[in-house]
């Protein structure tokens, strides 16, 4: 039961995380105008990965897409790439994990296959989350660098009568959405990997025959020394007479006409 819960929770957490990564990638507020020097501005600027926007105090908002590809900063291109890779990996991971879920039965899929799929999706979620966190962090670093550069420019060359106010940008909402979403995807991936360990079928249990030797009540089980000595992975208290030795958590029922893919 714990394995199913861990797997299911990992899936849900990753799903929320990937939805967040998609939302962050599409959001326009990656960087927003710093209002520290002018809290009563009548023009508010904010920028995303794909377009920059200006919201006027009058209520009108105008957004312009970055129609050039070569003219964009390499860092912005890198952030875009990281976010897209994160989304693609996450989407594939979600697809794989759907089929890996214990509660969904596809034909007579082996537990080992489900375990492998769970592990694969888990790794994909971890990489996806790391991509998102890396992308957002690279952008944040770029903002911090530009912020201090523009701050330095603000206080130099002010000998003239006319002031030229340079627009400074600070962290936008999308950065926080991205960090949280990346973290959730990462956590979901870790949970899937943990669930995979519980899903992995233990050594094949053959039909056991009990031989009652005089003096000692030892159950003989074909399959080597490990079977009865407490070493190896078979340390759970299991019934050894059912052929398909599984804990309650691992009961596999075969598809009936009421099962849906």
């Amino acid at each position: 039961m714990a394995v199913t819960a861990c797997q299911g929770l990992g899936f849900v957490v990753s799903l929320i995380g990937i939805a967040g990564i998609i939302a962050a990638t599409c959001m326009d507020q990656w960087s927003t105008q710093d209002l520290y020097n002018n809290p009563v501005t009548a023009v508010f600027n904010y920028q995303g990965l794909w377009r920059s926007c200006v919201r006027e105090s009058s209520g009108f908002t105008e957004c312009r897409g970055y129609f050039t590809l070569l003219g964009l900063p390499a860092m912005l291109q890198a952030v875009r790439a990281l976010m897209i890779v994160g989304i693609v990996l996450g989407a594939i991971g979600l697809l794989v994990s759907i089929f890996a879920l214990k509660c969904i039965r596809i034909g007579s899929m082996e537990d080992s296959a489900k375990a492998n799929m769970t592990l694969t999706s888990g790794i994909m979620f971890i990489v996806s989350g790391l991509c998102a966190i890396a992308g957002v962090s690279v952008f944040a670093n770029m903002l911090v660098t530009n912020f201090w550069m523009s701050t330095a420019n603000m206080y130099t060359g002010m000998g003239g009568m006319v002031q030229t106010v340079q627009t400074r940008y600070t962290f936008g909402a999308a950065l926080f959405v991205g960090w949280v979403a990346g973290g959730l995807t990462l956590i979901g991936g870790v949970m899937m990997c943990i669930a995979c360990r519980g899903l992995a079928p233990e050594e094949t249990n053959y039909k056991a025959v009990s031989y009652h030797a005089s003096g000692h009540s030892v159950a003989y089980k074909p399959g080597g020394f490990k079977a009865s000595t407490g070493f190896g992975s078979n340390t759970k208290n299991k019934k050894i007479y059912d052929g398909g030795a599984r804990t309650e958590d691992e009961v596999q029922s075969y598809p009936s006409k009421h099962d849906y893919v």
Partner: antibody, heavy 118, light 113 residues
Framework: DVQLVESGGGLVQPGGSRKLSCAAS????????MHWVRQAPEKGLEWVAF????????YYADTVKGRFTISRDNPKNILFLQMTSLRSEDTAMYYC???????????WGQGTTLTVSS | DIVMTQSPSSLTVTAGEKVTMSCKSS????????????LTWYQQKPWQPPKLLIY???TRESGVPDRFTGSGSGTDFTLTITSVQTEDLAVYYC?????????FGAGTKLELK
């Protein structure tokens, strides 16, 4: 057709109060920011106050801050300017204006005259 | 606060003449986000409310004759009337739209010779 009609002007004693109204029609009032702009006799234009569509953002000129209050009633399409502690320098023609693209005023009312005198 | 300086304070012209008036701000009105200058020009005839002519320093409001042209960037702006008509006799105001307070210039009065 967009129409803005101001009312409520008149003669007021110094230190007195007055409430100006601006009835709007011909556009979706709640989606536009609105302003009050005044013009003293034989003088230039002076911006007084601003309120955005949902009243979440309000700004005042330093000369009226603390004395004037801008508000709006979106269901009734009316803009208000509550004026208190009036001074002789508040004597002017008061216009309400609609805020437009480029942070400009595209439509103005005909104005209402306020005279502060003893 | 941004200070707006309009010059000249008055202009005496003859019909058909080309007129230019200036508006200077103490701070740049250029917004890098959309590459626009937040300066507006109005025309006010006697006993009438002001009328919007040009916004974003150079964008003509619909219905405004094309003899009115706005230009300039940053801190220096100009309103040009290519061929003055008698109906153009009025006071012209510039206004900042970049930051509060939304200051107006003192105005340029256009008079007929």
């Amino acid at each position: 057709d967009v129409q803005l009609v101001e009312s409520g002007g008149g003669l007021v004693q110094p230190g007195g109060s007055r409430k100006l109204s601006c009835a709007a029609s011909g556009f979706t009032f709640s989606t536009f920011g609105m302003h009050w702009v005044r013009q003293a006799p034989e003088k230039g234009l002076e911006w007084v106050a601003f309120i955005n569509g949902d009243s979440s953002s309000i700004y005042y000129a330093d000369t009226v801050k603390g004395r004037f209050t801008i508000s709006r009633d979106n269901p009734k399409n009316i803009l208000f300017l509550q004026m208190t502690s009036l001074r002789s320098e508040d004597t002017a023609m008061y216009y309400c204006a609609r805020f437009a693209r480029g942070n400009s005023f595209d439509y103005w009312g005909q104005g209402t005259t306020l005279t502060v005198s003893s | 606060d941004i200070v707006m300086t309009q010059s000249p304070s008055s202009l005496t012209v003859t019909a058909g003449e080309k007129v230019t008036m200036s508006c200077k701000s103490s701070q740049s009105l250029f917004n890098s986000g959309n590459q626009k200058n937040y300066l507006t020009w109005y025309q006010q005839k006697p006993w009438q409310p002001p009328k919007l002519l040009i916004y974003w320093a150079s964008t003509r409001e619909s219905g405004v004759p094309d003899r009115f042209t706005g230009s300039g960037s940053g801190t220096d702006f100009t309103l040009t009337i290519t061929s003055v008509q008698t109906e153009d006799l009025a006071v012209y105001y510039c206004q900042i739209g970049y930051t509060y307070p939304l200051t107006f210039g003192a105005g340029t009065k256009l008079e007929l010779k």
